[in-house]
């Protein structure tokens, strides 16, 4: 709390301008009316105030808006945003995408801070869903944003927003998240033709079920190994050798390099060795000829 002292004669601020950078903390407190600050907020960011001076200005705004800043003030916070706590931000009601962009710009180049996370949370909750424009904006600033959301939060993403997602936005998503996103992507891209569809859906295939992979294997898509390695193990296991060969096309040769890694390792263990031998890749570990394969999981389900 800045000590209350009278403003020295002639120092009362009539405008928010550059001259204020020479004011000591107590002078800012005494000589800058909160009402003046509120009307001319857009000037604050253009003036190189020190962090200590920004503390004084924040204190004035906090006092002026005990229930949280209005959007007309929030959109002009600029570097003052870095002074806000998540508790401050939880009081806000941010509805304008322009306001969100302005504040994200202040934090650009830094990791997502608790303040930014709270701001985004307030914004998305206010909108009710992650619409395309919002997703576009958030992933532009934070490519990993989508993968930072819980499956529950991702469920509020409408299929139409999936068009805004770039492959790099999904790099850090885990299977649980892709399970939610894949059906939305499938719906969003359903009217595209085969090759175009595959280009768009490829990044989401970590959430695809077996039947969709089987369908893709009939379309000469030539899936690369990197994509194949991200597929759900439980979705890959039921695929036949012929289906995997069709799915990967010329990339099938890459299976040899990945034979010790999931899901390739687990898939190999489920195939007959003589089927694997037809690939001519020297893949080992399949079921020897003459062995009967019992699906124990099916047996348990029946008993």
């Amino acid at each position: 709390e800045v000590e209350k002292t009278a403003c020295p004669s002639g120092k009362k601020a009539r405008e928010i301008d550059e001259s204020l950078i020479f004011y000591k903390k107590w002078e800012l407190e005494a000589c800058v009316d909160a009402a003046l600050l509120a009307t001319q907020m857009d000037r604050v960011n253009a003036i190189p105030f020190t962090y200590e001076q920004l503390d004084v200005l924040k204190h004035k705004l906090d006092e002026l808006y005990p229930q949280g800043y209005p959007e007309s003030v929030i959109q002009h916070l600029g570097y003052l945003f870095l002074k806000m706590s998540p508790e401050d931000i939880r009081k806000w009601n941010v509805t304008s995408l322009e306001t969100l962009k302005a504040l994200l710009e202040v934090n650009k180049g830094h990791e997502m801070s608790p303040q930014v996370a709270t701001l985004i949370d307030r914004f998305v909750k206010g909108r009710g869903q992650l619409d395309k424009d919002t997703l576009d904006t958030l992933t532009a600033f934070y490519p990993g944003y989508l993968c930072s959301l819980s499956p529950e939060e991702l469920s509020s993403v409408p299929p139409s927003s999936i068009w805004a997602v770039r492959p790099q936005d999904l790099d850090t998503c885990d299977p649980r998240q892709l399970d939610v996103l894949y059906p939305k992507a499938r719906l969003a891209f359903q009217n595209m033709n085969g090759s175009e569809y595959f280009v768009k859906i490829q990044s989401f295939l970590g959430g695809a079920p077996t039947e969709d992979l089987k369908a893709l294997s009939q379309q000469n898509v030539s899936m690369d190994l990197a994509t194949f390695m991200k597929l759900r193990t439980d979705a890959v296991l039921p695929l036949t050798v012929a289906e995997v060969q069709k799915l990967l096309g010329p990339h099938v040769e890459g299976l040899k390099a990945e034979e010790r890694h999931r899901p390739v390792r687990d898939w190999i263990l489920r195939q007959r060795q003589d089927d694997l031998d037809t690939l001519g890749l020297g893949l080992q570990g399949g079921i020897p000829n003459g062995y009967l394969v019992l699906d124990l999981s099916m047996q348990e389900a029946l008993s």
Partner: antibody, heavy 119, light 114 residues
Framework: EVQLQQSGPELVKPGASMKISCKAS????????MNWVKQSHGKNLEWIGL????????SYNQKFKGKATLTVDKSSSTAYMELLSLTSEDSAVYYC????????????WGAGTTVTVSS | DIVMTQSPSSLAVSVGEKVTMSCKSS????????????LAWYQQKPGQSPKLLIY???TRESGVPDRFTGSGSGTDFTLTISSVKAEDLAVYYC??????????FGGGTKLEIK
Amino acid sequence: EVQLQQSGPELVKPGASMKISCKASGYSFTGYTMNWVKQSHGKNLEWIGLINPYNGGTSYNQKFKGKATLTVDKSSSTAYMELLSLTSEDSAVYYCARVGGSSWYFDVWGAGTTVTVSS
Amino acid sequence: DIVMTQSPSSLAVSVGEKVTMSCKSSQSLLYSSNQKNYLAWYQQKPGQSPKLLIYWASTRESGVPDRFTGSGSGTDFTLTISSVKAEDLAVYYCQQYYTYPTWTFGGGTKLEIK
């Protein structure tokens, strides 16, 4: 001396619109939010809305949205309130009031403009 | 919106007497971060516009006589005039300015001189 000088009384017909002015002097007009307050029957005070003279930004009491429109002319340090589609319910004294220095109390008031809506 | 209730609606006192009037808000006007109450008192003399007397519940506006005192916290507030003068004949209003920008006024207390 800080002063707010309001325009004179008005007698208007129902359905008409009218504009009240409030000329500020003695302080930096763009540094303080201007508010408008309605007083009906010589008693109840109701906050109508505010305007930021610096950038023209406005906020209205939900009750007066569509009824009042606030504007400013920075060059003459004058705030205006236009009242639309007047009815007898709008007969009242209307005040402009400057917001206080440290918060949203009103430290300077105009003398008021009496509006009478009658056919 | 916060509802402000003033009582009594009117009272008559003799010159020199002490007078108190009450203002209650439907929710607390105390902001815990600065321990300030967002309440103002105004005086409106007959035929005049309102005049600010008190802000922050207890801070007298410059030029206001010290016989006027504001007190209270949270939801209950009082304006006291320690020794009434004939010129204090007026209606007194309280106003909350806690909820930006939906500020509300009380219905007023009319002070009459016997």
